[in-house]
Interface confidence: low
């Protein structure tokens, strides 16, 4: 994981400002595979290459995100860049042989946040729950929610209770949890990012 994202970033960073603008406009109308949503126009048009790479990966995952990027580049007449992107993506990545459809990543669904993608692993493996609660208290957790999580007897049940509140959270709230996880158990986040 990470190779395709870096390849997308490399490609987008090499576009001129005008080309990047054109890329975004084409991305708004490019045909998408069934089940994938479109990045909102307002957010898309203001992004730089790094932000756009993030969005492509979060909306379409690495493999399809790279494929989509290459398609748009090709549509812009940038065949060589599209070829380099696809070569970099497949280089040593254990990609499925030509003609064989790689199975979809079961853990990651289009548009899902990191904490939703790795819900089961986080419930099982987070040990420093109290620290997370302190980081989230007053920002995304009410006093009542904070106490409800603390009342659970084990770390997994605490995390399960915490996840019962996340459906009401927006991206920024979930990012707060991710940031807190990075600070309290960075090795776990890194392990999940690699998985």
């Amino acid at each position: 994981m990470g190779r395709a994202r870096d390849a997308i970033l490399d490609a987008l960073e090499n576009l001129t400002a005008e080309e990047l603008k054109k890329f975004k406009l084409k991305l708004l109308s490019v045909p998408l595979r069934e089940g994938y949503g479109r990045i909102p126009r307002g957010a898309l048009l203001s992004m730089d290459a790094l932000d756009l790479t993030d969005k492509l990966v979060s909306f379409y995952l690495e493999t399809y995100g790279a494929e989509l990027t290459a398609n748009v580049l090709r549509d812009m007449g940038l065949q060589e860049m599209a070829g380099q992107l696809q070569a970099a993506t497949h280089q040593g990545s254990g990609a499925a042989p030509a003609g064989i459809q790689a199975p979809p990543q079961s853990a990651a669904k289009p548009g899902l946040h990191f904490i939703d993608q790795h819900r089961a692993a986080l419930i099982a493996r987070v040990t420093n729950v109290e620290w997370l609660l302190d980081a989230l208290y007053g920002k995304v957790l009410t006093d009542e929610q904070y106490q409800a999580v603390r009342a659970e007897p084990t770390n997994p049940s605490k995390m399960r209770k915490l996840f019962s509140f996340t459906p009401a959270w927006n991206w920024t709230c979930k990012d707060l949890l991710l940031q807190a996880l990075r600070e309290s158990q960075s090795y776990l986040v890194e392990d999940l990012e690699r998985s």
Epitope: L9, L50, D51, D175, S186
Partner: antibody, heavy 124, light 107 residues
């Protein structure tokens, strides 16, 4: 403990170059980006540019394009900024900063950890 | 470039008071504004990001809010150690820009 340790103060002649270093500890270097910020004496803060160490990709404030070069050595968790063709206008404190990098695509360009700062003095 | 304007260069307050520092963006920045504290001779320190989210370990007397392109940073109960310069920064678009700073002085 997350820290960014910057190199010692630099005294340079006009026209010369200096290379500042910023060594990260307490976190995984390639999971975050590094930005550089300038502060002239008694002045505010100016963003110079950033590097994403995982890929080496850089982005600059146009004002500093051609003035600064950013590199990173992942093996030593160190980011570097070289400033060339120095003039008295470049005399300032230079900070390296860390920025988070997440999957969400939100605007993540705030600087959550700051280095100790390196003072650069350009004088003949 | 997006210009961030902090209208007050200096603000005077007393220990225990509530004080608010304002910052205005020259265009829409989607609430992507951070606030930093810089004490004399020290590096800046992140307090608030995305307008209202307190960074880890920051005391809850520090709060932030947004209304359109106007951003407000508030210290609900000023303490002696809060004497510093406070900067706003937009983290929405390149080049990432800072306000000119507001120096908080204790009466």
């Amino acid at each position: 403990q997350v820290q960014l340790q910057q190199s010692e103060p630099e005294l340079a002649r006009p026209g010369a170059s200096v290379k500042l270093s910023c060594t990260a500890s307490g976190y995984t270097f390639i999971n975050y980006g590094v930005s550089w910020v300038r502060q002239r004496t008694g002045q505010g803060l100016e963003w110079i540019g950033r590097i994403y160490p995982r890929s080496g990709n850089t982005r600059f404030n146009e004002k500093f394009q051609g003035k600064a070069t950013l590199t990173a050595d992942t093996s030593s968790s160190t980011a570097y900024m070289e400033l060339r063709s120095l003039t008295s206008e470049d005399s300032a404190v230079y900070f390296c900063t860390r920025f988070p990098y997440a999957f969400s695509g939100n605007s993540y360009w705030y600087f959550d950890v700051w280095g100790t700062g390196t003072t650069v003095t350009v004088s003949s | 470039d997006i210009v961030m304007t902090q209208s007050h260069k200096f603000m005077s307050t007393s220990i225990g008071d509530r004080v608010s520092i304002t910052c205005k963006a020259s265009q829409d920045v989607s609430a992507a504004v951070a606030w930093y504290q810089q004490k004399p001779g020290q590096s800046p320190k992140l307090l608030i990001y995305s307008s209202s989210f307190r960074y880890t370990g920051v005391p809850d007397r520090f709060t932030g809010s947004a209304s359109g392109t106007d951003f407000t940073f508030t210290i609900t109960t000023v303490q002696a150690e809060d004497l510093a310069v406070y900067y706003c920064q937009q983290h929405f678009d390149t080049p990432y820009t800072f306000g000119g700073g507001t120096k908080l002085e204790i009466k």
